[in-house]
């Protein structure tokens, strides 16, 4: 970058290299050129001649004014004409950055998915920062007392195999930058009470020919939970508003659900699951597409037909044996 | 283009004080090097300090180390030399010259500087 | 301190003739020398600069050359304008220091 280039002499930011979006700020370029009085210093930034706000302080200092900084990165470099050079000398060179202190994360979330030997924990970050952000991720047994921390720059997947500590622990998270430091609520959380069944797949759909034409669809998860809590969720391509069911099930085997839908309509389903009574549903499944025939011919839609392009992060609680229409869109 | 105007003739006792001064135009003080020669009558130019902007210093040499003050007033582009305790064989003409690519381009007219009792 | 010689000390020469001085230094100064024109009563006037660049409106019967701590001044064509002393002066280090000057008369 800029800051690797040789330098003669020096340049500052004030009041930091790393500063607050919207602030005022002073660049200083001081000269240090042998046999070279500078006539002139000039600032770049981003390779264009800066024109306006240059004062100059001494006679090899000079600085540059900013009111109102809004860029996340911008490259500095200023150069000084010295007499009898037939071009620009270059002094020196920084690479500025503005941004924002980070938001208390909150919102932590942390899940096993089933087989995946991990616990994955999220949390909303807040507002962008624009510039480097960490986050530690706090991890203390409430029972041994024992207190791990994982550095990352989003989320963070702990082996199941590290947490030695029992079942029950405080996890939080801390986020720090050149700006601040802000740290979570602590979350409590019981690993048996975080496991999110291994997803659950549309796998085809077929209409049956009957007096009321049917619509099966097939769908499997290879959970070895037993009791699990499932939502089917369908509309019509053309509408806003799923329609959604629910099944307790259980996955020895395949499961096929019923739908009596109107003919000759595009349709599209997803599905979902949790353990029965746990907190997590797993994200809705892949969008699985189905379109129900004109009139009387069997119609069967494999699951290598459907759309992949949007697994959708969702959840809908509703309760349990009723058929619902859900417009709320995808919620966490 | 830069120039240089120096003040007039001084005569002065021995053990006094001698101050020259050296207005500059064309270019503000702010970015220029302003040095010092003297030259004795019938001898060699001598350096006798300047403003160093590799390192952003005033630098006297060492004859006249403790004994000479170089000032500037950016208000007026005026430059200033002052030599104290003056001897008989400070007798000289004193120049301003301005630092360019490591030579002094632009002279003022000189100074003559008599000291005498 | 960086001392400065010049060789020689004087010389005589004719209109048209070529004229060299020289000028040594008792430690390396890469290219930062400058070479002087003084007229009696009159300021020094700098005629090169960085050991081998003509200052400009100097005529070009003027050139400098040498690097390290050997440089040379030549005037090729000597014009009765050319009398008077010339010096070398180094600017690689702390304090600049002047050669004692070649004193240059017309025959």
């Known amino acids: 970058g800029i800051t690797n280039i040789n330098c003669s002499g020096h340049i500052w930011v004030e009041p930091a290299t790393i500063f607050k979006m919207g602030m005022n700020i002073s660049i200083y370029c001081q000269a240090a050129i042998k046999n070279c009085q500078p006539r002139k210093l000039h600032f770049y930034k981003n390779g264009i001649k800066e024109r306006f706000q240059i004062t100059r302080i001494n006679k090899t200092t000079a600085r540059l004014w900013y009111k109102n900084f809004l860029e996340p990165h911008a490259s500095m470099y200023c150069t000084a004409e010295c007499p009898k050079h037939f071009q620009e000398t270059l002094i020196c060179g920084k690479d500025i950055s503005s941004g924002y202190p980070p938001d208390i994360p909150d919102e932590v979330t942390c899940v096993i998915y089933e087989y995946s030997g991990n616990m994955t924990c999220t949390w909303n970050a807040g507002k962008l920062t624009y510039i480097d952000t960490k986050y530690v991720v706090h991890v203390k047994s409430l029972e041994t007392e024992e207190e791990q921390q994982y550095l990352t720059s989003s989320y963070i997947n702990i082996s199941t195999d590290s947490l030695q500590g029992g079942k029950k622990y405080l996890v939080w998270v801390q986020a720090a930058n050149a700006l601040g430091m802000e740290e979570s609520k602590q979350l409590q959380i019981h690993l048996d009470d975080i496991v999110i069944p291994s997803a659950a797949v549309i796998s085809r759909a077929e209409t049956i020919n009957a007096t009321v034409p049917k619509t099966i669809i097939y769908w499997d998860s290879q959970t070895t939970i037993e009791k699990v809590s499932c939502e089917m969720r369908y509309k019509a391509t053309t509408n806003q508003t799923w329609n959604v069911k629910e099944f307790d099930t259980n996955f020895t085997y395949v499961q096929q659900s019923e739908f009596y839908l109107e003919p000759n309509i595009k349709y599209v389903f997803q599905v979902r699951c949790q353990e029965t009574g746990k907190r997590y549903w797993q994200p809705w499944s892949s969008l699985f597409f189905h379109k129900t025939p004109e009139t009387v011919p069997q119609v069967t839609s494999k699951a290598f037909q459907h759309d992949t392009w949007n697994s959708g992060l969702t959840v809908a609680s509703i309760s349990t044996g009723h058929l619902t229409s859900d417009n709320r869109g995808d919620i966490g | 283009q830069v120039q240089v105007v120096q003040s007039g003739a001084e005569v002065k006792k021995p053990g006094a004080s001698v101050k020259v001064s050296c207005k500059v135009s064309?270019?503000?003080?702010?970015?220029?090097?302003i040095h010092w020669v003297r030259q004795v009558p019938g001898k060699g130019l001598e350096w006798m300090g300047g403003f160093d902007p590799e390192h952003g210093e005033t630098i006297y040499a060492q004859k006249f180390q403790g004994r000479v003050t170089m000032t500037e007033d950016t208000s007026t582009d005026t430059a200033y030399m002052e030599l104290n305790n003056l001897r008989s064989e400070d007798t000289a003409v004193y120049y301003c010259?301005?630092?360019?690519?490591?030579?002094?381009?632009?002279w003022g007219q000189g100074t003559l500087v008599t000291v005498s009792s | 301190d960086i001392q400065m010689t010049q060789s020689p000390s004087s010389v005589s020469a004719s209109v048209g003739d070529r004229v060299t001085i020289t000028c040594r230094a008792s430690q390396g100064i890469s290219n930062w020398l400058a070479w002087y024109q003084q007229k009696p009563g009159k300021a020094p006037k700098v005629l090169i600069y960085?050991?081998?660049s003509l200052q400009s409106g100097v005529p070009s019967r003027f050139s400098g050359s040498g690097s390290g701590t050997d440089f040379t001044l030549t005037v090729s064509g000597l014009q009765p304008e050319d009398f008077g002393t010339y010096y070398c002066q180094q600017a690689n280090s702390f304090p600049f220091t002047f050669g004692p000057g070649t004193k240059v008369d017309i025959k």
């Open positions: 010259a301005i630092l360019e690519a490591g030579d002094l381009d632009c």
């Open positions: 064309g270019y503000t003080l702010i970015e220029l090097a």
């Open positions: 960085t050991a081998s």
